[in-house]
């Protein structure tokens, strides 16, 4: 049968049952995923918008697939095996009374079973297994997978020791706290910082430690994945996003019509095929574009390149370069340059590096 061909799997709770507090639903689903991640190399991340691998839905009766629910009792839930689209999705019958305890139907226990299906497991003939086809309440505080459940899931994915870094051929969600993590582009958007990687972005809100991962397509469906450079002009509520030789303009978080446009409209020579990184400095009202080992400076008021560019990055940004992946401006005096898994806090008034950090240091890793 099918399996997920990646170890980082996203899930999203589409809607919430009124039977329980939202936090209790979140907790039950998170703990249910944890049951499976504890015995496999799989890692699960909750996303709040966009297309997740596994969508969790509460619904009654006919609800968008061939398998209409049957009212209270009978079928409690069903889940689709791994795959695109509806693949992996778990549907819970809203006509059941969902609970955190032994009354009604326990959401955690049902979710453990359904997520087993979402991961590719069929039913077990062992009555002690969570994958046994009939529901039976057990104490959730002492709940454990049976040997049969563990054997089944490890036959599909291996055991947790096999969690060595996999390449990322399918743009599965990168591990945020992987010390080797690098970013494609980074920019501020108001009081938030957007970190772009593959088809994902992380959102860091000012000083709060919490970050959330989202799909680029969930916020901006018309934009591509693999954004390569980004910068913000906060006074205009504008964000510019670059990929290959094109750029998109986002105003007030909405994509402007008639984009993408060619990067050559900024005045780049024809040999420039893509931008590695970009940053706007509101003090000088200039945008710095980094391309390979050089950079250009663009006057946002006059809408033209400043004369005398390009210049070498290493010559004018001491200790930075020769190439960079991403950069953003913060706190009125710093550029944060990203090179691979390393990040450099650069004071542009003193013109020197003031701190060396890991690229993911913003996430409390």
């Amino acid at each position: 049968g099918p399996v997920w061909r990646k170890h980082y799997i996203t899930y999203r709770i589409n809607n919430y049952t009124p039977d329980m507090n939202r936090e209790d639903v979140d907790y039950a689903i998170r703990k249910a995923f944890q049951v499976w991640s504890n015995v496999t190399p799989l890692k699960f991340s909750k996303i709040n918008t966009g297309m997740a691998d596994i969508l969790v839905v509460f619904a009654r009766g006919a609800h968008g697939d061939f398998h209409a629910f049957d009212g209270k009792g009978g079928i409690l839930a069903h889940a689709f095996g791994p795959g695109s689209g509806i693949g992996g999705d778990a549907h819970f019958d809203e006509d059941e009374f969902w609970t955190t305890h032994s009354g009604g139907t326990n959401l955690f226990l049902t979710a453990v079973h359904e997520i087993g299906h979402s991961l590719g497991l069929g039913h077990s003939s062992d009555p002690k297994a969570v994958m046994f086809p009939t529901y039976k309440y057990v104490d959730i505080n002492t709940f454990r997978l049976s040997a049969d459940d563990i054997r089944g899931i490890q036959s599909l994915y291996g055991d947790p020791k096999e969690n060595q870094r996999l390449p990322n051929p399918d743009n599965s969600e990168p591990a945020l706290c992987d010390p080797n993590l690098s970013f494609d582009a980074v920019t501020t958007v108001g009081n938030k910082i957007f970190f772009f990687k593959d088809r994902f972005f992380w959102l860091k809100v000012s000083e709060r430690p919490k970050t959330s991962v989202n799909l680029i397509s969930s916020l901006w469906p018309t934009l591509p994945s693999g954004i390569e450079a980004a910068y913000e002009i906060e006074a205009r509520n504008q964000v510019f996003l670059f990929k290959d030789d094109k750029y998109w303009l986002i105003s007030n978080l909405r994509p402007e019509p008639n984009y993408p446009k060619s990067i050559h409209s900024f005045g780049f020579p024809n040999f420039v095929k893509k931008i590695d990184a970009a940053v706007f400095n509101p003090r000088f009202y200039r945008t710095y574009f980094f391309v390979d080992n050089q950079y250009w400076r663009y006057d946002e008021r006059r809408q033209m390149m400043d004369p005398g560019y390009p210049k070498l990055i290493t010559k004018n940004f001491q200790g930075i370069g020769p190439k960079i992946d991403a950069v953003f401006y913060s706190k009125n005096k710093y550029y944060y340059f990203f090179q691979g898994s390393n990040q450099f806090e650069y004071d542009f008034l003193l013109q020197r590096i003031t701190k060396t950090l890991k690229s993911n240091s913003w996430f409390g890793c």
């Epitope: 049968g1 099918p2 589409n14 297309m51 969508l55 839905v57 619904a59 609800h63 968008g64 697939d65 061939f66 398998h67 069903h78 889940a79 689709f80 095996g81 795959g83 695109s84 689209g85 509806i86 693949g87 999705d89 299906h117 069929g122 397509s217 469906p221």
Partner: antibody, heavy 122, light 103 residues
Framework: EVQLLESGGGLVQPGGSLRLSCAAS????????MHWVRQAPGKGLEWVSG????????FYADSIKGRFTISRDNSKNTLYLQMNSLRAEDTAVYYC???????????????WGRGTLVTVSS | DIQMTQSPSSLSASVGDRVTITCRAN??????LNWYQQKPGKAPELLIY???SLQSGVPSRFSGSGSGTDFTLTISSLQPEDFATYYC?????FGQGTKLEIK
């Protein structure tokens, strides 16, 4: 290469019967849900029936319930539609279509046959 | 029961035009919506699945969006081979179809 080839269509009188077949090749037939979809002349598509990987469960559109029976023979890689008590409004091109692999049908029809024409007329 | 309403039923456009077809469900179907293209005398072909995922081999000028009850299929720049009938579909329910004709 995935191929679905329907056969068994033809002219039949109202009240008559017909059995359509769909021969599958180029993929492992047994784990997939399979469906029949029809299209009356000059009209849109109408889903008719679907069947699970091992011959069950089966689903039917209300318009044909009790008259048509879907079945499959995994050893022959073949899907069938037994059509009884045929009516003029059953006149259509009948397509077989492949759904996803697994315990539940999604209705994501990624491969279709070319269709076979059934004409119900006196 | 779930019903799908597709609009418009027919549409005239020229090569190079941007075209949008909409499909509305009478209740939430999450992102469980597919789009098919059918040319005269041929079987339908899957274009977009799960509302916005492009089926392998389908040109990138086709895109889909939406979730819940409202969905759109967009062709960014019409090509001569795109003149056909388009259907939205969810499980056992198809929209009525949109015939795209040359202006």
């Amino acid at each position: 290469e995935v191929q679905l080839l329907e056969s068994g269509g033809g002219l039949v009188q109202p009240g008559g019967s017909l059995r359509l077949s769909c021969a599958a090749s180029g993929f492992t037939f047994s784990p997939y849900w399979m469906h029949w979809v029809r299209q009356a002349p000059g009209k849109g598509l109408e889903w008719v029936s679907g069947i699970g990987p091992s011959g069950g469960p089966t689903f039917y559109a209300d318009s044909i319930k009790g008259r048509f029976t879907i079945s499959r023979d995994n050893s022959k890689n073949t899907l069938y539609l037994q059509m009884n008590s045929l009516r003029a409004e059953d006149t259509a091109v009948y397509y077989c279509a492949r759904d996803i692999w697994g315990a539940y049908a999604s209705g994501l029809f990624d491969y279709w046959g070319r269709g076979t024409l059934v004409t119900v007329s006196s | 029961d779930i019903q799908m309403t597709q609009s418009p039923s027919s549409l005239s456009a020229s090569v190079g035009d941007r075209v949008t077809i909409t499909c509305r469900a009478n209740q939430s179907i999450y992102t469980y919506l597919n789009w098919y293209q059918q040319k005269p005398g041929k079987a339908p072909e899957l274009l977009i699945y799960a509302a916005s995922s492009l089926q392998s081999g389908v040109p990138s000028r086709f895109s889909g969006s939406g979730s819940g009850t409202d969905f759109t299929l967009t062709i960014s720049s019409l090509q001569p081979e795109d003149f056909a009938t388009y259907y939205c579909q969810q499980a056992g329910i198809f929209g009525q179809g949109t015939k795209l004709e040359i202006k």
